[in-house]
Amino acid sequence: KESCDVQLYIKRQSYHSIFAGDPFKLECPVKYCAHRPQVTWCKLNGTTCVKLEGRHTSWKQEKNLSFFILHFEPVLPSDNGSYRCSANFLSAIIESHSTTLYVTDVKSASERPSKDEMASRPWLLYS
C-alpha cells in the first residue's frame, strides 16, 4: 500500500548549472496524501541550513505531485551554493537532500560553458 508520509523528491548529490542574470526556478517536488504540508527552502552554510525569508516562492500542482518553487529573478553570483527544502508535517520536519546551484557569471566567461564543464571546473564558480 502507498505510504502516506510526505516525501520530497530531490535527488541526492543533484546539481543545476545556471548563469547569473538568467531567471531560474528551483523546484521541490512534494508528495502528500490529504493536507498539503508547509514547505520552506533554506541555503546551506556549512552544516547549518539558513531559512530563506522573504523570497518569491510559489506552488505548482501536477496530477500526482506538487512542486514548491523558489524563484531566482534573476540569478545572482551569490546564489551559488546548496539548497534544501523542508516540509512540516504532523509536527515533524521532513528534509530533502540538498541540491547545488553552480552559478557562472557570464561576464567572466567568454562563452557559456557546458553543464559538465561547469560542474567540473570550480574556478568558474562563485563560492
Partner: antibody, heavy 119, light 112 residues
C-alpha cells in the same frame, strides 16, 4: 519485472570508439541515477560515472573524463556509454546499474556486456 | 580519491559458521546529511553484482537476514551469521558519499 540489459559489446580495435546501450524496464528511469561500472577480467569493480536521466547531468571518474560520455533518453528508458580512443586495457565487462536517487530504495544491476579491445 | 581497503582478501569458512569481512575507508564516509553511504555487493561466480546492503546496515529486499552490516565513519563490517553454500561469492564494499565513487578490492568467500 525490473530489467537492465546492456548491449553493444564485442571486439573492437585500439583507437576506435564504441557505444554501449542499457535498456531498462520495470521502473521510471527518471527517478534514478544510471551508473556505468566496469570489471577487467579477473579484477575488481571500477566506477566509470553516472547520469541523471531527469536532466542529463553527469559525473565521471577523472580517468574517464573526456574519453567517456554517459547519456540517457528518459522517454525511451535507455542509457548509453560512449567510449572513445579505446585501449587494450579497456577490455572489461561493462555493467550499467540503476540506483533510486531519492531514498536509496533500490539498486539494480544489468548482466553486463564484454568489450574486448584488441588488434 | 577515497581508498577502500577490504580484509581479508579471501576467507574460507565452514557451512553454518560465521563469516566476517572488514572494509576500511581512507576518509570518513559520513555525509553532511548525517547518513553514511557505504554499500556491500555480492558477486557470485559468472554473475553480475547484486546490491546486498546499503546505508551501512540496511538489507536490500529479498536478502536473507543472516547478512548484516555495521560500522561508522571509516570502519565497516559485513557479517554472515551462518554461512550457506549459496553464499560462495566475492563481496565488495563501495562508497558513494564522495566523488569519485570507489570500491574495495573484493573479498573471495569460499567454503571450507
Amino acid at each position: 519485472e525490473v530489467q537492465l540489459v546492456e548491449s553493444g559489446g564485442g571486439l573492437v580495435q585500439p583507437g576506435r570508439s564504441l557505444r554501449l546501450s542499457c535498456t531498462t524496464s520495470g521502473f521510471n528511469i527518471k527517478d534514478t541515477y544510471i551508473h556505468w561500472f566496469r570489471q577487467a577480467p579477473g579484477k575488481g569493480l571500477e566506477w566509470v560515472g553516472r547520469n541523471d536521466p531527469a536532466n542529463g547531468n553527469t559525473k565521471y571518474t577523472a580517468s574517464f573524463k573526456g574519453r567517456a560520455t554517459i547519456s540517457a533518453d528518459g522517454s525511451k528508458s535507455i542509457a548509453y556509454l560512449q567510449m572513445n580512443s579505446l585501449k587494450t586495457e579497456d577490455t572489461a565487462v561493462y555493467y550499467c546499474a540503476s540506483y533510486e536517487g531519492y531514498y536509496e530504495r533500490f539498486g539494480y544491476w544489468g548482466q553486463g556486456t564484454l568489450v574486448t579491445v584488441s588488434s | 580519491d577515497i581508498v577502500m581497503t577490504q580484509s581479508p582478501d579471501s576467507l574460507a569458512v565452514s557451512l553454518g559458521e560465521r563469516a566476517t569481512i572488514n572494509c576500511k575507508s581512507s576518509q570518513s564516509l559520513l555525509d553532511r546529511d548525517g547518513k553514511t553511504y557505504l554499500n556491500w555487493l555480492q558477486q557470485k561466480p559468472g554473475q553480475s553484482p547484486k546490491r546486498l546492503i546499503y546505508l551501512v546496515s540496511k538489507l536490500d529486499s529479498g536478502v536473507p537476514d543472516r547478512f548484516s552490516g555495521s560500522g561508522s565513519g571509516t570502519d565497516f563490517t559485513l557479517t554472515i551469521s551462518s554461512l550457506q553454500a549459496e553464499d560462495l561469492a566475492v563481496y565488495y564494499c563501495w562508497q558513494d558519499t564522495h566523488f569519485p565513487y570507489t570500491f574495495g578490492q573484493g573479498t573471495k568467500l569460499e567454503i571450507k
